[in-house]
Interface confidence: low
């Protein structure tokens, strides 16, 4: 057993261009809070999959109001550590998700509104009992700086918190087969305490609280002899006494699922189906309450102050499920018209409209050329909800304000080289091609394919295009 601890140092704009706007304003003051989700191993799981190692929610940070005109600074953070207790061994490799949430404190109908500002994820190796590990993660233009560690709760010690230490009974030595507990040399490694009731003759354990059966015995406490009459599930070596195949050790032997959980084998390991009120890899975490942070994605937990009472997750907009673990894809309804891009901001839907359209759902078609002037003799052309200028020769850009580089469009075909000229461009054709844009191949016999070269110009000479 032990605790994973996360310390957030700063959350603010990352270095470089494109600093994000402050998430809070004078009209909408807000405050931040964080959620951490831990999973064992290095699996790249979906954000919504269960936090099998545990989850925690921070307190709310101080209320923050943006100073008008100021760039987003590092935002004020909640006090204290985020702590995720774990009951089993620390797995050594783990995946994490850290979410930064904004709670808007304006006049919201039905209470405060939450929206996800940033989500970072990673996979790390970490030994319990080690020093704080520092990390920087980026999500969009935001940057999160944090430290984390895993520490064992006494009497557990070791990199996985599986060794137990007890004070020495004699000053000079530990008991037979037991080593001193480094770095606590005045304590001794304690023998493993198996699951209560585990048969001392037919069961053993490699981790505290488990009960694994010797061959020929089964049941949660290894007290049930394996039936040799039917021999229906041959998986192991032949028994010399019965001539029958005794099942060899399988992942569900000894039932690794605690608290009445049922075990089913998977191709690689096992899976526990836990009764209500228990969760975790082996159903070892009991009495889920709001203190365990069971609501994902910023869901608000209500009730469940004691292990016997249920909790209810009130999900923020955009999420559903008993633990707010499922994301609602509200953009699948295609609410934005005229090709607008749908953005689900969690607390609201937004439509980013194509040029020439406006309105909350991009429903208004604008007069594309109204009030639009094309410079330097260009003319405005409407069409497809977008305004564009047809520019006079020598000018380009959206409003014909830029002097055009006539060679930018690579007008010379077949590898011809383009030269900008005050009155247009000139193409110097590669051998074997001719024409104003080097578009015509020269036949091997010297005759050109449409049209003939003007007098005085040999194939390969620069061709002026006006």
């Amino acid at each position: 057993a032990g605790v994973f601890e996360l310390q957030i140092h700063s959350f603010g704009p990352g270095p470089g261009p494109g600093a994000p706007r402050s998430p809070c304003s004078a009209r909408l003051p807000c405050r931040l809070f964080f959620r951490v989700c831990l999973k064992p191993g290095l699996s790249e799981e979906a954000a919504e999959s269960p936090c099998a190692l545990g989850a925690a929610l921070s307190a709310r940070g101080p209320v923050y109001t943006e100073q008008p005109g100021a760039p987003a600074p590092d935002l004020p953070l909640p006090d204290g550590l985020l702590q995720v207790p774990f009951r089993d061994a620390w797995p050594g490799t783990f995946s994490f998700i850290i979410e930064t949430w904004r709670e808007e404190l304006g006049d919201q109908i039905g209470g405060p509104a939450w929206s996800l500002l940033a989500r970072v994820a990673g996979r790390r190796r970490l030994a319990a009992g080690g020093p704080w590990a520092r990390d920087i993660q980026r999500a969009g233009a935001w940057e999160l700086r944090f430290s984390y560690r895993a520490r064992c709760e006494p009497p557990a010690v070791g990199t996985a918190c599986t060794r137990l230490c007890r004070p020495r009974s004699a000053p000079s030595r530990c008991g037979p087969g037991l080593r001193p507990c480094a770095p606590l040399e005045d304590e001794c490694e304690a023998p493993l305490v198996c699951r209560a009731g585990c048969s001392p003759e037919h069961g053993f354990c490699e981790q505290p609280g488990e009960c694994r059966c010797l061959e020929g015995w089964t049941g949660p406490l290894c007290t049930v002899p394996v039936s040799t009459s039917s021999c229906l599930s041959p998986r192991g070596p032949s028994s010399a006494t019965t001539g029958c195949l005794v099942p060899g050790p399988g992942p569900c032997d000894g039932n690794p699922c605690a608290n009445g959980g049922s075990c089913s084998e998977t191709p690689r390991s096992f899976e526990c189906t836990c009764p209500r009120g228990f969760y975790g890899l082996r159903c070892e975490v009991s009495g889920v309450t709001c203190a365990d942070g069971p609501c994902f994605n910023g869901g608000l937990c209500v009730g469940g102050a004691d292990p016997d009472s249920a909790y209810i997750c009130h999900c923020p907009p955009g999420f559903q499920g008993s633990n707010c673990e499922k994301r609602v894809d509200r953009c699948s309804l295609q609410p934005c018209r005229n090709g607008g891009l749908c953005l689900d901001l969690g607390h609201a839907l937004r439509c980013r409209c194509r040029a020439g359209f406006a309105g909350p759902r991009c429903e208004h078609d604008l007069d594309d050329c109204a009030g639009r002037a094309c410079a330097n003799g260009g003319t405005c052309v409407e069409g497809g909800g977008a305004h564009r200028c047809s520019c006079a020769l020598g000018f380009g850009g959206r409003d014909c304000r830029e002097r055009a580089d006539p060679c930018a469009a690579r007008p010379c075909a077949h590898g011809g080289r383009c030269y900008a000229h005050f009155s247009g461009l000139v193409c110097a054709c590669a051998p074997g091609y001719m024409g104003a844009r080097c578009e015509f191949p020269v036949h091997p016999d010297g005759a050109s394919a449409l049209p003939a070269a003007p007098p005085g110009l040999r194939p390969g000479d620069p061709q002026r295009y006006l």
């Epitope: 790249e44 490799t93 970072v120 994820a121 990673g122 996979r123 980026r138």
Partner: nanobody
């Protein structure tokens, strides 16, 4: 530390194909952004394509529809499949890793590990 070794470069006619590989070794368990970059003589280094730990990809406009970036996590290898090659694709191609990348974004200015590069030459 992460070591990156590129391979698969060479000379090819315009319109041909090449597949570049980048094998990572060392401290590779972290969640990475990985990218391909290229540098032609006398030109700035430019990003070609990148891929985030969640598998999402992005491409430079000049290679969209012709190049495909992918990775094989089991082999710790990044790939760049280059089809319909053009003479202007001639460059030294480098693969790079951003150890901090997450949340679906890669930052071309912050890649902290680079390979030695592999030369791609496309002739017309």
């Amino acid at each position: 530390q992460v070591q990156l070794v590129e391979s698969g470069g060479g000379s090819v006619q315009a319109g041909g194909s090449l597949r570049l590989s980048c094998t990572a070794s060392g401290d590779t368990y972290r969640s990475y952004c990985m990218g391909w970059f290229r540098k032609a003589p006398g030109k700035e280094r430019e990003g070609v394509a990148d891929i985030v730990s969640d598998g999402s990809t992005s491409y430079a406009d000049s290679v969209k529809g012709r190049f495909t970036i992918s990775k094989d996590n089991a082999k710790n290898t990044l790939y760049l499949q280059m089809n319909s090659l053009k003479p202007e694709d001639t460059a030294m191609y480098y693969c790079a890793v951003d150890r901090g990348g997450s949340g679906g974004y890669c930052y071309t200015g912050r890649y902290d590990y680079w390979g030695q590069g592999t030369q791609v030459t496309v002739s017309s």
